[in-house]
Every structure is written in C-alpha cells, then in structure tokens.
Amino acid sequence: ITQQDLAPQQRAAPQQKRSSPSEGLCPPGHHISEDGRDCISCKYGQDYSTHWNDLLFCLRCTRCDSGEVELSPCTTTRNTVCQCEEGTFREEDSPEMCRKCRTGCPRGMVKVGDCTPWSDIECVHKESGTKHSGEAPAVEETVTSSPGTPASPCS
C-alpha cells in the first residue's frame, strides 16, 4: 500500500483509540504508529482506511465538490461517496468534474439512454442504430434528464 497524497486535518483531535497490529498490519479504520507498536484509530469524518494496512497516516476524506451531492458520509473505514447532481454526469475520461448532460439528440438520431450521474444521454442513428458521441450541433427534441440511481465514490 502506498499513500503519498494526503491532506491536512482540519483540527486536532483527542487521543485516538489504540490496539495492537497483527503481523505488522492494522485493521480498516486505523493506521500504524511510527514505532510499529500500536494501531491508532482514524478520525471519524476526517480520515479513513479501507484495508488492513501499515499506513503512517490515515487517508483524508474526500469533500464533495459543488455540483455534487453526498450520498454517504466518510466513516473511519469508507471514503465519502459523491454523485453528480441531476442533469450532470462524470465521464471516465475526466472524473475530476461533473459535466452537463445534453438536452437532446442531433437531427436524424433518437435517444435510447437517459442522462445518469455517470453517463450522458445516449443517441443512435434512426436508421442504422449506431451510437453517436460528441456534442450535438442541433437539437431535434428536448429531453428531460432523469437522475440515475447507482453512485460512485469520489476519486
């Protein structure tokens, strides 16, 4: 496990709960002390660890960006789960931001898939049925975006 990019805690916390490492590793929700003797609890709502580890620092909780909604909060064992707001989506190519879904398909195409938090609307050619990607130069019909149900954790 390699952890390089962790951000600062916002405030000091009281002494964390401790336990002993098992075979040099600490359980989820903890990090190891620098002398290797103790497992120190992560701080709820501030940092976390998801696996057995020898991290010297717990991982910093993600804060949902504007344009995202928090589906579940950060716990000591799980990062925050954020999802794009209704009418926006996060592409695999650019996961750092939510983009607005298109409101309709180009001429000669029909909508076969709704806007979801992880994908734009899906358009296919009326005749061939082949998919179209990219911005629509013209809109034939207005599509009401509908939010999807699955969520993805923030990266």
Partner: antibody, heavy 117, light 108 residues
C-alpha cells in the same frame, strides 16, 4: 546506542542518478518508520520522504515525487533513497532520520549531494 | 500542507537571558505531533522537544515547550553559551511533515 550512518553522496550532473544508503544500529530497525530530510546550503530543513517499518507504505514531498524512491532492507538494517533525474535544486545535505510524525529523534551526520554540470 | 511560521527570524540576546521562540501553524496541529529542534553550524539537527512539551532524552530542563492548536512556544529560561544556534519547529499532524523556516538565536 542508536547510530545512523549515511553514504552515497557526491557530485552528479543534472539528469543523473545517485543512491543514498543509511546503515542503522542500536534499535529494532524493522519496527520503526524512517525518513530522509535534506538541507540546501544556507537554507532550512525540508522533509523528503518516509517509509513505514515494513516498507509497505511510502510518502514523498511533491518536489521529489516521481523522481526519488525510498526503500529499506530490514535484513541489512539499511534505508535507501534512489534519486533519479537530479536537478540543481536537489543540491543539499541529505540526512537519514528515525521517525516521521512525533519528531525525528535520531539523525545521521548527513551526506552531501551536489548536482552541477 | 500545513505551513509553520516561526518568529522572530533572529533573536539577539545575552547569556543568562530568557529566549521565547514562536511557531504558528496554518491549521490546527495536535500537540502529539509538534516537535522542536536545535541545529548548530555543520551539525545535524537535535530533537529538543516532542509532543509540544516533552523534553527529549538528555535535554536540559532550561528548555521547555508549550502551546496547542495553532500556536506553540519554545522557551529557554536562561541562555547558556552553547544554546546559540538555529531552532526549528516541525509538525507531523498531516503529510507532508513540514518544518518552520527557523529562528536564529545569536549573541547580542
């Protein structure tokens, strides 16, 4: 008595590589997190990298990320810092230090790395 | 990252006087993760104080540390000739560990 002894420093051209070593004794090396800290001539202290006791977790300063690699051989009680793509601004005395978070309680004598053409 | 700002940059005092060095953090730091070091020319730093107020092994009791949150202080109650040096604070609350820029205590 805890002792940390660095070696491997020297003069290297920009873009070149060096590997620093730190031989540790006087404590249970494999239990402790270790760090490298550097000090440019006439400047203050800058933490460079750290590694957990088992070697499973590593940490780097942004200034060296992707160029430097910290590692350890617990069977030899030795800490390493592999430095690639060296730049003039990497010129410094490099110290091996015991600890990371609660203070560096023991330091080596330092080894000078000079990056110059 | 947490930025530590030390003041003053230089402190000019005479032996026997009291030295008060300040370290201010840009974000709150747990007392457990605040340390102070002394460094003399040509030497490696030496740990003086860890956990904001605990003296390291072999450190004379004229050195003391205090503070919490974002404000920490190193006090040398009566300066001895060997105390003239540069002093650094350091935090390990969150990565990367960072040092203050240092305070030089020089002979007046």
């Amino acid at each position: 008595e805890v002792q940390l002894l660095e070696s491997g420093g020297g003069l290297v051209q920009p873009g070149g590589s060096l590997r620093l070593s730190c031989a540790a004794s006087g404590f249970t090396f494999s239990s402790y997190a270790m760090s490298w800290v550097r000090q440019a001539p006439g400047k203050g202290l800058e933490w460079v990298s750290a590694i957990s006791g088992s070697g499973g977790s590593t940490y780097y300063a942004d200034s060296v990320k992707g160029r430097f690699t910290i590692s350890r051989d617990n069977s030899k009680n030795t800490l390493y810092l592999q430095m690639n793509s060296l730049r003039a601004e990497d010129t410094a005395v490099y110290y091996c230090a015991k600890g990371v978070r609660k203070g560096f309680d023991y330091w080596g004598q330092g080894t000078l790395v000079t990056v110059s053409s | 990252e947490i930025v530590l700002t030390q003041s003053p940059g230089t402190l000019s005092l005479s032996p026997g006087e009291r030295a008060t060095l300040s370290c201010r953090a840009s974000q709150s730091v747990s007392s457990s993760y605040l340390a102070w070091y002394q460094q003399k020319p040509g030497q490696a730093p030496r740990l003086l104080i860890y956990g904001a107020s605990s003296r390291a092994t072999g450190i004379p009791d004229r050195f003391s540390g205090s503070g919490s949150g974002t404000d920490f202080t190193l006090t040398i109650s009566r300066l001895e000739p060997e105390d003239f040096a540069v002093y650094y604070c350091q935090q390990g609350e969150s990565p990367p560990p960072t040092f203050g820029q240092g305070t030089k205590v020089e002979i007046k």
